[in-house]
């Protein structure tokens, strides 16, 4: 008995598509072995039509695909544009066609609907609109026009030209009589329901000379599109419902049990708490299409999603809908990185952002998720030297450590910095990740003076006190600019006296600026790092003024001014307030991801994110 299982019989019609799911025991060998779909020949062989190794027969070119879902122990064969020639006996299987790990499937494709014994067949998707055309002869031009639905043995009046509308169709049906030149009336039914399916009869006149026309209305539930994304990655649902619902509220919901579809997000401002900080509903186009981006995918995000349009902002009968089945691949190429980073007021955080290693040259971005309305993510910094004006001097995006990870450092933290931030690039949109910054009680570990004023032509020494916990770390000073923080020479001045209960391992490291010039004005950071992995930083603003009295300046902690809450920026700074991640196409077209993605090489920060995936500050 073969362990492979699937549908024994599949029936469809010409022009339609089928999705055949084959189940296999999800052992590690089975998960990675070749999957195939082959057609059985009269003489017993089985000719491969498509396989998981990329082979597609010319018979299936452009109309079939095979997708493996290793966690579920299934693979799915999609075949579109069916013809009667596709009818036959097939096998879905694992390994080599002739080895017996397979299941027999019979596919029967029947003739597509057209005119069945003078019955016009209308095939329309759920929630959409159908127009049933009813011709009549001149002698019935002035007579009553009507549409009936066959319910069991009896025709039930749906609508007529005298103004009657069946209660089941109220508000979504109309009868149009064409101009005098055309001997035709039409019935338009909107927001089609599954219950609308059936046999209809349109009639002009009521006597024996009446004109009659049969119609068969078939209402289809939308075929869900299979979407397969990596754990911790991102998914984008593109929803195109048509211009007729352009001004109707839109929603994305997730089917929970049975018919319930819980709203994930809608244009009326509703958002499910589980998606806080990791979802954006992108503004819709004029044609009513919109997209929803979800980042930081979790195992529990897997399921069936519907997007639709309805004034209530949720699924109702007659909502036009689109459907997806999201599978979340736990064998993810996206490395683990902390989902929560903690910092203290006045302190700093260093956030590690993963990106696709194959796209090292891509532009990196960091944005702040805002929940207002449908959510947006205005950019704060990019790897091309742009920093949002309000973040000057306290935010830097570094390409280090590289090889699939970049670093974002934010210091001078306040409670206003708490929130959700997204790491992304202009390359692979599936690699958008989310991190939450939490501001907790505590004191910054690094101690520096507040504002410092240097005198032109003199020497300035700025101290930075490192507690003993950083004894094994590299300590540095650097000068901040839009493109990063350029390292500067510094002097180790021995143990610091700034810490109580801290032994000889504490350190005072000073920055010395000799013969200060105007160019020395700006933000300076002191910080710690281990190799290419950055830890805490502290920032000092150095102002430069004309000489008042001779001598050098040695700044102590006690004499320093408090750092200003907000700095006035010079007008020359390039400020792009409007740069926001809303439409993912702002940066790159969504790319189809090749099946053979690089496995992450496990390189990541030496921070142990632990089972909670939380990182306290940036200290290790």
């Amino acid at each position: 008995k073969s362990p492979i299982f699937g549908p024994e019989e599949v029936n469809s019609v010409e022009g339609n598509s089928v999705s055949i799911t084959c189940y296999y025991p999800p052992t590690s060998v089975n998960r990675h072995t070749r999957k195939y779909w082959c057609r059985q020949g009269a003489r017993g062989g089985c000719i491969t039509l498509i396989s998981s190794e990329g082979y597609v027969s010319s018979k299936y070119a452009g109309r079939a695909n095979l997708t493996n879902f290793p966690e579920n122990g299934t693979f799915v064969v999609n075949i579109a544009q069916l013809s009667q020639d596709d009818s036959g006996r097939y096998k879905c299987g694992l390994g080599i066609n002739s080895r017996g790990l397979s299941f027999d499937v019979s596919l029967e494709v029947s003739q597509g609907p057209g005119l069945l014994n003078d019955t016009k067949v209308y095939t329309v998707d759920l929630g959409r609109t159908v127009t049933i055309n009813c011709p009549f002869k001149t002698e019935n031009a002035q007579k009553r026009k009507s549409l009936y639905k066959q319910i069991g043995l009896y025709p039930v009046l749906v609508i007529d030209s005298s103004g009657y509308v069946n209660p089941n169709y109220t508000g979504r049906i109309r009868l149009d009589i064409q101009g005098t030149g055309q001997l035709l009336f039409s019935v338009v039914i909107n927001q089609l329901r599954l219950s609308d399916a059936g046999q209809y009869l349109c009639q002009a006149g009521d006597d024996s000379n009446s004109n009659k026309k049969n119609a068969d209305l078939q209402v289809l539930k939308p075929e869900p599109e299979l979407v397969y994304e990596d754990l911790r990655g991102s998914v984008t649902f593109h929803c195109a419902l048509g211009p007729e619902v352009a001004n109707v509220a839109k929603f994305l919901c997730r089917q929970s049990s049975g018919e319930n579809c819980d709203v994930v997000v809608n244009t009326l401002g509703k958002r499910a708490p589980a998606f806080e900080g990791r979802i954006l509903l992108n503004p819709q186009d004029k044609d009513g299409s919109f997209s929803v981006v979800i980042t930081g995918l979790r195992k529990e995000d897997a399921g069936r999603y519907l997007c639709g349009a309805h004034s209530d902002g949720q699924l109702q009968e007659g909502s036009p809908i689109q459907a997806w089945q999201l599978f979340v691949n736990e064998e993810s190429t996206i490395p683990r990185s902390p989902t929560v980073v903690k910092g203290v007021a006045g302190g700093s955080v260093a956030v590690l952002c993963p990106y696709n290693r194959k796209e090292s040259k891509s532009i990196k971005y960091w944005c702040l998720w805002e929940g207002a309305q449908n959510g947006r993510c205005p950019l704060l910094v990019d790897s091309e030297g742009w920093v949002k004006a309000q973040y000057e001097g306290r935010l830097s995006l570094l390409e280090e450590p590289g090889n699939g990870t970049f670093t974002v450092i934010l210091n001078q933290l306040t409670s206003r910095d708490a929130g959700f931030y997204w790491c992304l690039t202009n390359g692979d949109t599936l690699w958008r990740t989310t991190v939450e910054i939490k501001i907790i009680e505590g004191e910054p570990n690094l101690k520096v003076p507040g504002n410092v004023t240097a005198v032109l032509g003199e020497t300035l020494k700025v101290p930075c006190h490192f507690p003993c916990k950083f004894s094994s770390y590299e300590k540095y000073w650097c000068k901040w600019n839009n493109t990063g923080c350029q390292a500067l020479p510094s002097q180790d001045e021995g143990p610091s006296k700034a810490f109580v209960n801290c032994d000889e391992n504490s350190r005072l490291v000073s920055l010395t600026l000799n013969l200060v010039t105007r160019a020395d004005e700006g933000w300076y950071w002191c910080g710690v790092k281990q190799g290419h992995f950055y830890g805490e930083t502290a920032a000092v603003y150095v102002a430069v003024e004309e000489r008042k009295a001779a001598g050098s300046r040695d700044v102590s902690l006690a004499k320093a001014d408090a750092a200003p809450d907000e700095k006035v920026l010079d007008s020359g700074f390039r400020e792009i307030e409007n740069k926001a991640i809303q439409d993912p196409r702002l940066f790159a077209e969504e790319k189809a991801v090749a099946d053979t993605r690089d496995q992450a090489d496990g390189s990541r920060a030496s921070v142990d994110s632990g089972s909670s995936e939380e990182q306290g500050g940036s200290s290790r």
Partner: nanobody
Framework: EVQLVESGGGVVQAEDSLRLSCAAS????????MGWFRQAPGKEREFVAT??????????YYDDSVKGRFAVSGDNTKNTMNLQMKGLNLEDTGVYYC??????????????????WGQGTQVTVSS
């Protein structure tokens, strides 16, 4: 409230035929999957057959033990399903349950892939 009602059970001789029916009521949506499970005294509930609808395609699944003898059919616009059973044998005895779900994800052989269940109808095959 959703209800599934099975009918057609009874006592038959070995090698005889029987036709079971299942009707769902209380649903505003068409079902995407309806299946038959059976449970013999003292045994686990086991999969018999399932029919799935997706778009204008129909998919039929059978357990090996009933292949070639049982045929499942149905109409998802009416939310009804039938099971035509031929060549019945003593091992086919048990309570036959109808199960249904509005969508068709998960392995159709597992009870967890169905949300709605009927009360069951008894089929007894005597020698």
């Amino acid at each position: 409230e959703v209800q599934l009602v099975e009918s057609g059970g009874g006592v038959v001789q070995a090698e005889d035929s029987l036709r079971l029916s299942c009707a769902a009521s209380g649903l505003s949506f068409s079902l995407s999957r309806m299946g038959w499970f059976r449970q013999a005294p003292g045994k686990e509930r086991e999969f018999v057959a399932t029919i799935e609808w997706s778009g204008r395609s129909t998919y039929k699944y059978y357990d090996d033990s009933v292949k070639g003898r049982f045929a499942v059919s149905g109409d998802n616009t009416k939310n009804t399903m039938n099971l035509q059973m031929k060549g019945l044998n003593l091992e086919d005895t048990g309570v036959y349950y109808c199960a249904a779900n509005p969508n068709n994800y998960g392995d159709p052989r597992t009870p967890g892939a169905y949300q709605y269940w009927g009360q069951g109808t008894q089929v007894t095959v005597s020698s």
